[in-house]
């Protein structure tokens, strides 16, 4: 019969005949003869590979180096990457989170509109009208302003988009 | 051209031991899977042990498991057979082949 | 394990005419990855096995093409178009499908 030209899938040529691929988690050892199979072996301990393949050595985990803030979000296994995230506080700088910066804060006169996650950082809004915020905070959402008018009060000193309005008490009318 | 050269038979008594080695040239031996056949005199071929290219994976029938270990050494193109426990019924010409080639054979004979 | 039946298991031949050997086994040979790692070897007297078909009906390099493989599942055969003086010795088939890989128990061709 013809060699081949093309293999099926999951399949690859090499000297002009068909041999499998190996599958997720296991490496190339020795191509498919006219005799015997593929000969795969199985990635070792701290590696993978998470495709069919004929890689002759399997990749190394990733390290989440706790040094860069990193944390293993998911331990890797033969046929999948370690995962990192941030720890507390902080957030993966890019996409493939080799590192870590603290979360930002928003600044007096704005508040959070999202809370930070291991992978994306706090996004502030400034404080609209009705609304302040006086601290530094990854937290804190913009505050409304006291309304003076439930409690009987009238503005005495009015808010900011840093500062709460300030209630007193009404004038007394003179007789 | 191909070579597969046996050597290691000899007499040996009931339970003793006995390592053939296969000498290989010719061909990329790392590629290939090699085997043990044997052949008792006057009778039929019979498949005695089997290890991949890259050694990584060994095979016996139940009548050798257990007391016949094959490797590998690509290093050195060479394949081996470790026989322990050797009973009367192993007395047989032992052939190293890939399949494709088959050297000359090596007489191993176990009697007391 | 996997048996091979081989038929006749002896065949007398006139030079110049056509021959035909049988092996069936007694399972499917195919391999879970859709191979049949079948086989055909011709020992020739006082010599080694020598490979003459692989994966049924591929003919290995130099054997002559009046040597032909067919079949697939369990029926097997090995037809010799013209029968020539040098073509004697005994014949195996040979299954590395399933482990224990297995031989047939031969068929002797001779002259008449």
């Known amino acids: 019969p013809e060699p081949p030209t093309a293999c099926r899938e999951k399949q690859y040529l090499i000297n002009s005949q068909c041999c499998s691929l190996c599958q997720p988690g296991q490496k190339l050892v020795s191509d498919c003869t006219e005799f015997t199979e593929t000969e795969c072996l199985p990635c070792g301990e701290s590696e993978f590979l998470d495709t069919w393949n004929r890689e002759t050595h399997c990749h190394q985990h990733k390290y989440c180096d706790p040094n860069l803030g990193l944390r293993v979000q998911q331990k890797g296994t033969s046929e999948t990457d370690t995962i990192c995230t941030c720890e507390e506080g902080w957030h993966c700088t890019s996409e493939a989170c080799e590192s870590c910066v603290l979360h930002r804060s928003c600044s007096p006169g704005f508040g959070v509109k999202q809370i930070a996650t291991g992978v994306s950082d706090t996004i502030c809004e400034p404080c609209p009208v009705g609304f302040f915020s006086n601290v530094s905070s990854a937290f804190e959402k913009c505050h409304p302003w006291t309304s003076c008018e439930t409690k009987d009060l009238v503005v005495q000193q009015a808010g900011t988009n840093k500062t709460d309005v300030v209630c007193g008490p009404q004038d007394r009318l003179r007789a | 051209e191909v070579q597969l050269v046996e050597s290691g038979g000899g007499l040996v008594k009931p339970g003793g031991s006995l390592r053939l080695s296969c000498a290989a040239s010719?061909?990329?031996?790392?590629?290939?899977?090699m085997s043990w056949v044997r052949q008792a005199p006057g009778k039929g071929l019979e498949w005695v042990s089997e290890i991949s290219g890259g050694g990584s994976y060994t095979y016996y029938p139940d009548t050798v498991t257990g007391r016949f270990t094959i490797s590998r050494d690509n290093a050195k193109n060479s394949l081996y057979l470790q026989m322990n426990s050797l009973r009367a019924e192993d007395t047989a010409v032992y052939y190293c082949?890939?399949?494709?080639?088959w050297g000359q054979g090596t007489l191993v004979t176990v009697s007391s | 394990d996997i048996v091979m039946t081989q038929t006749p298991l002896s065949l007398p031949v006139t030079p110049g005419e056509p021959a035909s050997i049988s092996c069936r086994s007694s399972?499917?040979?195919?391999?879970?990855?859709?191979?049949?790692?079948f086989e055909w070897y011709l020992q020739k007297p006082g010599q080694s096995p020598q490979l003459l078909i692989y994966?049924?009906?591929n003919r290995f390099s130099g054997v002559p093409d009046r040597f032909s493989g067919s079949g697939s599942g369990t029926d097997f055969t090995l037809k010799i178009s013209r029968v020539e003086a040098e073509d004697v010795g005994v014949y195996y088939c040979?299954?590395?499908?399933?482990?224990?890989?297995?031989f047939g128990g031969g068929t002797k061709v001779e002259i008449k």
């Open positions: 994966k049924v009906s």
């Open positions: 040979f299954q590395g499908s399933h482990v224990p890989y297995t």
């Open positions: 399972q499917s040979i195919v391999h879970s990855q859709g191979n049949t790692y």
């Open positions: 010719g061909f990329t031996f790392s590629s290939y899977a």
């Open positions: 082949a890939s399949r494709a080639y």
